[in-house]
Structures are given as C-alpha cells and as structure tokens.
Interface confidence: medium
C-alpha cells in the first residue's frame, strides 16, 4: 500500500518531519534509513531504521487527586523491517504502571461564622452598594477544603443626594470618504469627521461641566496610491536536477511574477511560484553499523591456573559486542569490539552476608492485566572480601582496577523464615486502563 514519505524522524516527539510526498511504497521510502513514513495523514509515524524502543512517555496524571492511586506510562516499538528486544513487532506499546499520591489527605468542607456588620455605602451621592463579611472558621476547612457559598454579600444603598453629570464626548463619527481613490485629480481630496457631547450630556441641576475641545476635525487625504496594475506569471523554468544520490529526493520548477510585474499596489500573482516532484534514484542509501549491547563477561580466569575462585588472586575476563546493520558501504562501527578487565572470582564462594534495608516499591505488575500488585524486597547481600582494589600487573604500566565477578553464596541469619530474599506485596489502587494514545476513538 502507498505511504506518505518524510525525510526526518524526530526521536524526542516521535513525529515525522519534512514531507517528501505520498504515493510511494514503504520499501522505496525506506531505501534511505534516515527517512520515515505514515500509513495515513496524522497517523503513527514510523522511522525507516531498524526497530528499537522509543523513550518512555511521561507518567500520566494520578488516577485520583487525593489518597493513593495509580498512573501509567508507555513506550512504543518504532522502526521498520525487524523487531524490538522481546521479539516485539513495530507499533507495539509497552506499558508501566506505578502507585502515586498527589495529596495524602482529601479536602474537608468548613463552616461559616455569623455575618459581620454592614460597611458604609460605597458612594456619597445617588445610589451605591454596601457590604458585609463572614469568616470560614466554624469549623475551619481541612486539607485544602473550603466553605460553601460566598464570604461576603452586598445590597443596594441610597444616599438621597443627587450627583452632577459632567459632559463627555461620544466617539468620533467615521471619516467622510475622499473624493478620489487614486492621486492626480483636479481637487485636493479632504475628509471630515464629527462627534457629539452626548455620552453623557452635562446636567443642568446640579450643573455639570461641558465637553472640552472641538466637535469636528478635517484633514487632507494624503498618500493616495497611483492606480494599481495586477501581476501575471511568466512561464515555468526548467526542472532542477535530483538533489540526492540515493533514495527519494525532490526536484523543483520555478516561475516569476513578471508578465507583467505588479505595480502601484496591484495584487501579486495568485498561486505558487514553485512546484515540486518526487525523484527516485532507486539506489539504497548507506546504512552505518551500530554496536549491539555488550555481551556477558567471560568467566574470571588466570592462565595456567585451574581455578582462582574464592582466592585473593587477580585474573582477567573479556566481553564482546557485534557491529550490526552495516549495508551499502555505510560506516563501520567506531571503537573496540572487545573489552578486557582485571577481576577477582567470587563465583559460588560462601560469604558472610547481611540483610539490606527494604528496597523502594517496584512497578505495578502486570500494568495492562488484571489485579496488578507491587512488591519490595530485603536481600541477603554478601560482604565482599577486603582484597586490594587495584593491582600492578607489569612494571611501569601503572595500577589497574580490579572488579569482583561471579555469583557468591551469601549466608545470613534466617529472616521471616527466609535465607536469601524477603518479599512484601501490596495491591495497586484505582488502576486506569491502558489506552493506546494513537488509536482513534471507535
């Protein structure tokens, strides 16, 4: 099926940028792995590179505004022609759910005291308003609550005194039209406007002040343009060469608004001065290699020794990684394929252990399934031997850091009937549904 092809994929927002055009196949669009595509306008944007997980979205708001609730976040498998880790198809969402608490307590209403005395009238002549107030302290609200209703009320009051009314101008009327729309006629064009002292008129008893200034004004019509000439398009120019050497590009034709040129404020030519076409080199673009994540460290050994486990004898171990995805003469991966370090082997060594503090509460699992729970643990943590943290392997080569490697067998006193892990579980509350943000409402 044809897709909309774009020249850029914005990792931070997951949006397609730089529309190249529509009506091309995914395979043609993805000849260049820097490109991206959409199956329909406004739909999900997928980059042409090999699939990998997007960044996690921000956590959604807590499902309740007070007390304990739950909140979700997601990430999406984005890319083309492959799968993300976990053997997951592009377009798939992975969710995480965690407990949350915006505010520990829920608001409680308060009650009003009695009304206070009326304040004086707001004006000294004619009619105004007066106000009285009451306090929200009978009892006071708790946890950000409030009292129902208003803290003050007002009523009309009459001073029995007549106020004077001062005159004020109404808005200016419109300028009379100029006698000509283009300059160069026999008479100098003029325009006039007037206003009335009626907003309001000054009172007689008690006497109000009259309006200041003049009731009309006149001015010359300046800056009238010469009569306009509308612009017209010249012919289309030649098609520009295809600007890319691989994948899809965009060629362009141009024309100029000079047949005739617009004059004296005449309208510019309607329509576009350029038009574009997609050009297809049918050549795949180079794809640079990307390092896979490092493999596991090899066992910690020392040449000519059967085992160095549980001994203060430094050994060596290595790990490797693979350069994947390099195609069509792209760049090789930069950096080393193998990593070597010095190590002490504590594989299967019986070590004295101590119980850790409680871990923080984990995520709610399953985030999109029924009855999610969260857990925390205390672990029997081994006390590592006090071997030297650095060694000097060859004279003059300086000190090298030495890392402990292997899974020891820690020994702790029993805790709640357990020797290695004590776990506490708790259900997650007010769990929201996992709603696909890209899915339209059905």
């Amino acid at each position: 099926d044809p897709v909309l092809c774009f020249t850029q994929y914005e990792e931070s927002s997951g949006k397609c940028k730089g529309l190249l055009g529509g009506g091309v196949s995914v395979e043609d669009c993805c000849l260049n792995t820097a490109f991206a595509y959409q199956k329909r306008s406004g739909g999900l944007c997928q980059p042409c590179r090999s699939p990998r997980w997007s960044l996690w979205s921000t956590w959604a708001p807590c499902s309740v505004t007070c007390s304990e609730g739950s909140q979700l976040r997601y990430r999406r498998c984005v890319g083309w022609n492959g799968q993300c880790s976990g053997k997951v198809a592009p377009g798939t969402l992975e969710w995480q759910l965690q407990a949350c608490e915006d505010q520990q307590c829920c608001p409680e209403m308060g009650g009003w005291s009695g009304w206070g005395p009326w304040e004086p009238c707001s004006v000294t002549c004619s009619k105004g308003t007066r106000t009285r107030r009451r306090a929200c302290n009978h009892p006071a609200p708790k946890c950000g609550g409030h009292c129902p209703g208003q803290a003050q009320e007002s009523e009309a009051c009459d001073t029995q005194q007549v106020c004077p009314t001062h005159g004020a101008w109404a808005t200016w009327g419109p300028w009379t039209p100029c006698s000509a729309s283009c300059h160069g006629g026999p008479h100098e064009p003029k325009e006039t406007r007037s206003r009335k002292c009626s907003a309001p008129e000054p009172s007689q008893k008690p006497p109000g002040k009259p309006c200041p200034g003049l009731a009309y004004e006149q001015r010359r019509c300046t800056g009238l343009p010469p009569c306009p000439v509308a612009g017209g398009w010249g012919p289309w120019g030649p098609v520009s060469p295809c600007p890319v050497t691989c994948g899809l590009g965009q060629t362009m034709e141009q024309r100029t608004c000079n047949h005739p040129v617009p004059q004296h404020g005449g309208p510019f030519c309607a329509g576009d001065a350029t038009r574009t076409h997609i050009c297809n080199t049918a050549v795949p673009c180079p794809v640079d290699g990307e390092w896979d994540s490092w493999g596991e460290w090899s066992p910690c050994i020392r040449r000519n020794m059967k085992s160095i486990s549980c001994q203060e004898i430094p050994g060596q171990q290595s790990r490797g990684r693979t350069c994947r995805g390099r195609k069509f003469d792209g760049h090789r991966c930069a950096g080393q394929q193998q990593d070597i370090r010095h190590c002490y082997s504590i594989q299967h060594c019986p070590l004295k252990g101590s119980w850790s503090e409680w871990s923080t509460w984990g995520l709610c699992m399953p985030p999109c399934g029924p009855n999610p729970t969260r857990a925390r643990q205390r672990l029997c943590t081994p006390l590592l031997p006090k071997y030297p943290p650095t060694v000097s392997m060859v004279e003059g080569q300086g000190e090298k850091n030495v890392t402990f490697w292997g899974r020891p067998l820690p020994r702790c006193e029993e805790l709640q009937g357990q020797k290695l892990v004590v776990e506490e579980k708790r259900p997650c509350l007010h769990v929201p549904a996992c709603k696909d943000p890209e899915e339209e409402e059905l």
Partner: nanobody, 129 residues
C-alpha cells in the same frame, strides 16, 4: 489452560449479517485478551479483530472496520463478533484465540498470531448469492 470453542458460522447472502460467539473455559478467562483471525482457502491466516482483557481497547483490521463489532462478557466467559454487510471476500474459517494480557498493547501487537497461546478449531462462514 484455556479451552476455546467457536460457534455461529454458516451460509449467508451478500449484505447479510451473522453473529459468531467464542466460549472459553477456565476461571482465568478475564485475564486474557481475545482475538479473531480468519483463513480463506489457499491464503494465509489474517487478523480480524482483538479486545483487551478489560475491554478498554478494541482493534479492527482496516478491511472490516465499520462492518464488524467485537465485544466480551467476563462474567459469561464469552466473546462475540457481530458480522454485518458481509461480502463474498469475507468467506473463510474464523478462529478465536486467547493471548495473555500484561506489559504490551497496540494493534500491531494483537494482530500478530504468535502472541496468542490458545486457539479454537474454527467455524466456517460462507458468503454467497
């Protein structure tokens, strides 16, 4: 373990309607997402529709959107697929399947047959004048 049994298939004229049901045994039915797939003679198995464990998300293939409706009742351990405005190209064996709900969601995930753990034997729908 979940056993899945489809029913409701049959012969119907173009433009007609049919209701397929999928009954599942086992107390854990409500923790599974349920999907429908179809397979026409000589063709690959094709995704039709899917519904998450809580019914919060329903996904349809573009070819059936607006004509087919998927729903579920966790109390009755049943999923229904209502087929309206049927066309001859809808002729196929329709299969119901159950997938575990957990970390993942989205049309692309639930349209992949590989994520479904339990499948029914299928029910035949024939659309013919």
């Amino acid at each position: 373990q979940v056993q899945v049994v489809e029913s409701g298939g049959g012969l119907v004229q173009p433009g007609g309607s049919l209701s397929l049901s999928c009954a599942a045994s086992g107390r854990t039915f409500s923790s599974y997402a349920m999907g429908w797939f179809r397979q026409a003679p000589g063709k690959e198995r094709e995704f039709v529709a899917a519904i998450t464990w809580d019914g919060a998300n329903i996904y349809y293939a573009d070819s059936v959107k607006g004509r087919f409706t998927l729903s579920r009742d966790n109390a009755e351990n049943t999923v229904w697929l209502q087929l309206n405005s049927l066309k001859p190209e809808d002729t196929a064996v329709y299969y119901c399947a159950a997938a575990e709900s957990g970390r993942y969601s989205g049309r692309d995930y639930y349209s992949a047959p590989g994520v479904y753990l339990y499948w029914g034997q299928g029910t035949l729908v024939t659309v013919s004048g």
